[in-house]
């Protein structure tokens, strides 16, 4: 079952998943000036069996130069700047998807992909929060949110994270504090570790990832 809402928004923080539960869908979105090919898939789907999960369908973008791309015909109500519905992930693939059964790893980028990724999460999905650059994490508890089903409705748990405006940033669970940080790389926050099995597995996964996984656009 798809989660009804998006994960909660935390001021001055972004979220990402370390792995995606089977059933998760990813929109095939193209960058400006390109569009999905007519016969192409609308979504990629994380699918699999007990031993192997992978993304079904392929996203393909083609130039829309021959088409009129100015399609706004009436003003949007209370016009707003476009926001990243779900944080874009970097194309790094350091973790074997089989390390978390029933989950897919981040799909590789496709040509002319949009600079944001829009996911449709399923019940049981966990996402992790990190303060944006220039903000420091104050933890009251785990900086994570899980989509849960209660009384036939889905809800995301509230991450216990406050981002305060200091020139330091937090990291994903399991990331080690660097010996020296000439580029001002984020410090580790160990207080966000909890003891659920799922989280431990994903913490181990997170430990193998570099801070660049929070890049919102491909270089």
């Amino acid at each position: 079952e798809l989660c009804d809402d998006d994960p909660p928004e935390i001021p001055h923080a972004t979220f990402k998943a370390m792995a995606y539960k089977e059933g998760t869908m990813l929109n095939c979105e193209c960058k400006r000036g390109f569009r999905r090919i007519k016969s192409g898939s609308l979504y990629m789907l994380c699918t699999g069996n007990s031993s192997h999960s992978s993304w079904d369908n392929q996203c393909q973008c083609t130039s829309s130069a021959t088409r009129n791309t100015t399609k706004q015909v009436t003003p949007q109500p209370e016009e707003q700047k476009e926001r990243k519905t779900t944080e874009m992930q970097s194309p790094m693939q350091p973790v074997d998807q089989a390390s978390l059964p029933g989950h897919c790893r981040e799909p590789p980028p496709w040509e002319n992909e949009a600079t944001e990724r829009i996911y449709h999460f399923v019940v049981g999905q966990m996402v992790y929060y990190q303060c944006v650059q220039g903000y420091r994490a104050l933890h009251r508890g785990p900086a994570e949110s899980v989509c849960k089903m209660t009384h036939g409705k889905t809800r995301w748990t509230q991450p216990q994270l406050i981002c305060t405006g200091e020139m330091e940033t937090s990291q994903f669970p399991g990331e080690e504090k660097p010996q020296a940080s000439p580029e001002g790389r984020p410090e580790s926050e160990t207080s966000c570790l909890v003891t659920t099995t799922d989280f431990q597995i994903q913490t181990e996964m997170a430990a193998t990832m570099e801070t660049s996984i929070f890049t919102t656009e491909y270089q």
């Epitope: 095939c28 193209c30 609308l42 399609k71 015909v73 949007q76 707003q80 519905t85 829009i118």
Partner: nanobody
Framework: QVQLVESGGGLVETGGSLRLSCAAS????????MAWFRQAPGKEREFVAA????????RYASSVKGRFTISRDNAGNTGFLQMNSLRPEDTAVYYC???????????????????WGQGTQVTVSS
């Protein structure tokens, strides 16, 4: 010229029902995702429901799930929002929107939608 025209709004008592329609011209609904948003006075625009033309994904805001149903008649190029068990907090201007890509849902997800109607007022009295 693309046009989305909403109709079916009005004044209804708490617990009542309304069926909103969205008639499209200039685009074909059978290759567009269709969505409904709403905006109450002094509040941000809010996602209500969306459904792609392939019926792969249908999403609802948790506040309306189980009460509202989004449907579409691709042949007639019309979308619908059936609203049951209406509450005073459902009072808003309801907008129909469409896009060529897949469903985009969420709190402030309107930006990716390409086409918008002018809105229809729904008022639920207590």
């Amino acid at each position: 010229q693309v046009q989305l025209v909403e109709s079916g709004g009005g004044l209804v008592e708490t617990g009542g029902s309304l069926r909103l329609s969205c008639a499209a011209s200039g685009i074909t609904f059978n290759d567009h995702t269709m969505a409904w948003f709403r905006q109450a006075p002094g509040k941000e625009r809010e996602f209500v429901a969306a459904r792609d033309w392939s019926d792969i994904i249908t999403r609802y805001a948790s506040s309306v799930k189980g009460r509202f149903t989004i449907s579409r008649d691709n042949a007639g190029n019309t979308g619908f929002l059936q609203m049951n068990s209406l509450r005073p907090e459902d009072t808003a201007v309801y907008y129909c929107a469409a896009r060529e890509g897949g469903v985009v849902a969420g709190v402030r997800s309107g930006a990716p939608y390409d086409y918008w109607g002018q809105g229809t007022q729904v008022t639920v009295s207590s």
